[in-house]
């Protein structure tokens, strides 16, 4: 499995998106886990709602949230108030029974807040093409089931 780097700023939120094949993983709950060492186990941080149909509901564990757009095929994890100790290797997982398939390996890199004088050498301000609101977040559009919408699997 290839690894994707997501970089965020200490003290801010980082949004990680793990795309997947919605057909292949239809009906499966998802999870976010932290890899303990290169060959070690992956320690569960948070998983989607116990009822798969409610996977779009955001679930929190501490400062980490998870939500799943099961139709679009995007699992989104939010790490709130990112801290240096949040840096490291994670996995997005698809669960079936007691098994877990890796959807994506994610390397979270935490960087200093450019406006934090303790870390800043020369001050940096966002240019025209960057804003703090947008710059540190990978946006992904999630949609939940509308009232009365039947959750059929997508057709190819």
């Amino acid at each position: 499995h290839n690894t994707t780097v997501f970089q965020g700023v200490a003290g801010q939120s980082l949004q990680v998106s793990c795309p997947y094949d919605s057909m292949k993983h239809w009906g499966r709950r998802k999870a976010w886990c932290r890899q303990l060492g290169e060959k070690g186990p992956c320690q569960r941080v948070v998983s989607t709602h116990n009822l798969w149909l409610l996977s779009f509901l955001r679930r929190w564990n501490g400062s980490t949230a998870i939500t799943d757009d099961t139709l679009g095929g995007t699992l989104t994890i939010t790490l709130r108030n990112l801290q240096p100790h949040d840096a490291g290797l994670y996995q997005c997982q698809s669960l079936h029974g007691s098994e877990a398939d890796t959807l994506r390996k994610v390397l979270v890199e935490v960087l200093a807040d450019p406006l934090d004088h303790r870390d800043a050498g020369d001050l940096w301000f966002p240019g025209e093409s960057e804003s703090f609101e947008d710059a540190h977040v990978e946006h992904s559009i999630s949609r939940s089931l509308l009232e009365g919408e039947i959750p059929f699997p997508p057709t190819s």
Epitope: T3, T4, V5, Q7, P84, E109, V110, L111, H136
Partner: antibody, heavy 118, light 107 residues
Framework: EVQLQQSGPELVKPGTSVKMSCKAS????????IHWVKQKPGQGLEWIGY????????NYNEKFKGKATLTSDKSSSTAYMELSSLTSEDSAVYNC???????????WGQGTTLSVSS | DIQMTQSSSSFSVSLGDRVTITCKAS??????LAWYQQKPGNAPRLLIS???SLETGVPSRFSGSGSGKNYTLSITSLQTEDVATYYC?????????FGGGTNLEIK
Amino acid sequence: EVQLQQSGPELVKPGTSVKMSCKASGYSFPSFLIHWVKQKPGQGLEWIGYINPYSDGSNYNEKFKGKATLTSDKSSSTAYMELSSLTSEDSAVYNCARSSYRYGFDYWGQGTTLSVSS
Amino acid sequence: DIQMTQSSSSFSVSLGDRVTITCKASEDIYNRLAWYQQKPGNAPRLLISGATSLETGVPSRFSGSGSGKNYTLSITSLQTEDVATYYCQQSWSIPWTFGGGTNLEIK
């Protein structure tokens, strides 16, 4: 003004090591990853890896593991790359570059030319 | 590793032409694509990141489009200063990889 100033050209013998530097100015050094890119004369670009100056964590292209070692020094806002067991294949221009929050390399150093010859 | 394949390594164009350079990834890179311009003896210059976002100071004649595996860099009306080699680069999967480059030369 953001600048990445790289050390001068190097002419070294096969089997030796070299350490080149990339001094950043004009921005908060620990707030951006610093990457290293190799370019052989008349050829394309090859990503070596990056250093996170905030955490001192690094990440390498498998191809360069054991060849390149990336470090940084926050106090001097400088990133370093050491290349070991040099051969003629390592002769190239090496650039440092900063990656933006959209993951592109928005500022580049001028390059350090490495020549490995006996 | 994700392979990045650029349409052609070199092609001749005329000043004022609309130029389109394509880049195909071996798998979906979810818009984590950048375009660079490099002139002989110089470091590359970032033109576009996130597949479509034009960097500050880059002329508006440059634009980026695409999604999934297929991406395009367009120059609406080629100027003398645009004669260079153009590279695409993905940052979705480690190792980050570049296309082989497309060299524009004047007819």
